[in-house]
């Protein structure tokens, strides 16, 4: 799991209730106007539009990504930017706004009739980070599920994990994604930290399977911080 | 549509700990953008208590619990928690699990803002000597 920058906030001094929200039991609570960030020592007055701090996509909502917000910023400092309508620059689906995708570089248009023919090809260009799609999270790079008949076995180009069979999962491979096996117990993984490491990896390993996570092997305790090794083991 | 149920609640002393689970069922709750706790104490309107990412890496608290509640999920039992500690009177509430699908747009405020969540029916604690 990700340690977020946002990791355990106080949200202090909510404000008075708006009054009820339709369909809920109760009112509404309005949002925090301070937030402790931690190490710090005074709350933070925020607003609707400060920068959303995150470490990968499905942090951000569905009209952003996450990215740094500078060309060739600090990898360490990403935050969730507005999403690229059609015709703009991009680098990976994610980059897209909801009913588009990355295509050679540009967000062009997913209407399925022009979609269809390339998804091949588009999929070979995906240099997104995918934890995304990692458990079945609906993501916009996307692929309608109508066009898959058959989900894809090991080995088998994919943009999301929902386009895996069962046990697999959809990871990096070089530039491309493809089905590879969920982990088990003992297996070595991937423990991401904040720095856009994430981001950087050629061959993406799976998650952990259901009720492992991915921890510091027991007798690497002692190691250094850079050479610890990190195993599925039990909850 | 999701399903939320509440457990866990009771009576409890000063001091003492409860944890409360919530489990949600008909969806999964790593569909699910956020995982909330809120809670309506006697007479007053509901308040946002705690709330956790879908990455388990964000996790929110109201000023009021901050150190003595943990907010945490287990996305392979499809289940919530709220731990308890240090329990005080003034805690004395219907607690509420709630789960709020992905924004648009991501904010803080968007974990503490009540009618981005579906809800569950709530379960009482009540911190009395």
């Known amino acids: 799991t990700l340690n977020s920058v946002l990791n355990s906030n106080a949200i202090k001094n909510l404000p008075p209730p708006l009054g009820g929200a339709a369909g809920h039991p109760g009112s509404a609570v309005s949002a925090a106007p301070g937030i402790l960030y931690p190490g710090g020592n005074k709350y933070q007055t925020i607003d609707n539009y400060q920068p959303y701090p995150c470490a990968e996509d499905e942090e951000c909502g569905t009209d952003e990504y996450c990215a740094s917000p500078t060309r060739g910023g600090d990898a360490g400092v990403q935050i969730c930017l507005a999403c690229r309508k059609r015709r703009k620059r991009c680098m990976r689906h994610a980059m897209c706004c909801p009913g588009n995708y990355c295509k050679n570089g540009i967000c062009v248009s997913s209407d399925q009739n022009h979609f269809r023919g390339e998804i091949e090809e588009t999929i070979t260009e995906s240099f997104g980070n995918d934890h995304s799609t990692l458990d079945g999270y609906s993501r916009r790079t996307t692929l309608s599920s109508k066009m898959y008949h058959t989900k894809g076995q090991e080995g088998s180009v994919c943009l999301r994990s929902s386009d895996c069979a069962s046990g697999l999962c959809c990871a990096r491979h070089f530039w491309s994604k493809i089905c590879k096996p969920v982990l088990k117990e003992g297996q070595v993984c991937t423990k991401h930290r904040r720095k856009g490491s994430h981001g950087l990896e050629i061959f993406q390993r799976c998650y952990c399977g259901e009720g492992l996570s991915c921890r510091i092997q027991k007798d690497h305790h002692q190691a250094s911080n850079s050479s610890r090794l990190h195993t599925c083991q039990r909850h | 549509e999701v399903q939320l149920v509440e457990s866990g609640g009771g009576l409890v002393q000063p001091g003492g700990s409860l944890r409360l689970s919530c489990a949600a069922s008909?969806?999964?709750?790593?569909?699910?953008?956020?995982m909330g706790w809120f809670r309506r104490a006697p007479g007053k309107e509901r308040e946002f208590v705690a709330a956790i990412s879908r990455s388990g890496g964000t996790t929110f608290y109201a000023d009021s619990v901050k150190g003595r509640f943990t907010i945490s999920a287990d996305n392979s039992k499809n289940t919530a928690y709220l731990q308890m500690n240090s329990l005080k009177p003034e805690d004395t509430a219907v607690y509420y699990c709630a789960a709020a699908p992905r924004p648009k747009r991501a904010s803080v405020q968007y974990f503490s803002t009540s009618s981005n969540y579906d809800w569950g029916q709530g379960t009482l604690v009540t911190v009395s000597s």
């Open positions: 008909g969806y999964t709750l790593k569909n699910y953008y956020a």
